[in-house]
């Protein structure tokens, strides 16, 4: 999987969208690793 900064951000945006935004506040692009996905 792509692990560039931009890929991580887009992937997280998709995850937040699917979860309705119900995730921890610190679940942000700069504070998650690729393992979070």
């Amino acid at each position: 999987a792509c692990d560039t900064a931009t890929c991580v951000t887009h992937r997280l945006a998709g995850l937040l969208s699917r979860s309705g935004g119900v995730v921890k506040n610190n679940f942000v692009p700069t504070n998650v690793g690729s393992k979070a996905f």
Partner: antibody
Framework: EVQLVQSGAEVKKPGASVKVSCKAS????????MNWVRQAPGQRLEWMGV????????TYNRKFKGRVTITVDKSASTAYMELSSLRSEDTAVYYC????????????WGQGTTVTVSS | DIQMTQSPSSLSASVGDRVTITCKAS??????VAWYQQKPGKSPKALIY???YRYSGVPSRFSGSGSGTDFTLTISSLQPEDVATYHC?????????FGQGTKLEIK
């Protein structure tokens, strides 16, 4: 309102260094990566590097061979790009850019900073 | 580094025309491609991410498609305000790389 406001135009001599700033507002600065991209006259956009403002970790374009340094001042929500050993080919418009999810899912760019390298 | 080759370099079309710009990557970049619109003297503005997804606020006449090495930006009905240079970018690998740009003019 999300804003990335860059420092003003610079004129430098060959061999000198330049440091461009990018002040972010309207979002949590440390939550999102900050990229630096430049555009020389008549040339394609060129990605220079990215920084994680939360950790300070950077990734650079190898093309710049150690001439570029990206840093942040978290307390001032400001990113910096320093380019050393300037040559005429470094004459370009330099942009900061950050892809956000909140408050809006969008790829925001600064207004650009013109750097002219001339003897 | 991944080479992004855009074509054409420039094109002239009439208001209402369907316009297609293509971008070819030198290696497989999945769908990790973005498209930007840049008007003279302005910063690039993001249009498309992940090859085919429009950012909020981008008019529906803009669409993107493709995967692997071949990508397309289509403007379904050209408007006068679409006069600009369009850039593709791959962000699958570091360093991110851009196409050389396509300058779009109105006939």
């Amino acid at each position: 309102e999300v804003q990335l406001v860059q420092s003003g135009a610079e004129v430098k001599k060959p061999g000198a260094s330049v440091k461009v700033s990018c002040k972010a507002s309207g979002y949590t600065f440390t939550d999102y990566y900050m990229n630096w991209v430049r555009q020389a006259p008549g040339q394609r956009l060129e990605w220079m590097g990215v920084i994680n403002p939360y950790s300070g970790r950077t990734t650079y374009n190898r093309k710049f061979k150690g001439r570029v340094t990206i840093t942040v001042d978290k307390s001032a929500s400001t990113a910096y790009m320093e380019l050393s050993s300037l040559r005429s080919e470094d004459t370009a418009v330099y942009y900061c850019a950050s892809l956000l999810i909140r408050p809006h899912y969008f790829d925001y760019w600064g207004q650009g900073t013109t750097v002219t390298v001339s003897s | 580094d991944i080479q992004m080759t855009q074509s054409p370099s420039s094109l002239s079309a009439s208001v209402g025309d369907r316009v297609t710009i293509t971008c070819k990557a030198s290696q497989n970049v999945g769908t990790n491609v973005a498209w930007y619109q840049q008007k003279p003297g302005k910063s690039p503005k993001a249009l498309i991410y992940s090859a085919s997804y429009r950012y909020s606020g981008v008019p529906s006449r803009f669409s993107g498609s493709g995967s692997g090495t071949d990508f397309t930006l289509t403007i379904s009905s050209l408007q006068p305000e679409d006069v600009a240079t369009y850039h593709c970018q791959q962000y699958n690998f570091y360093p991110y790389t851009f196409g050389q740009g396509t300058k779009l003019e109105i006939k």
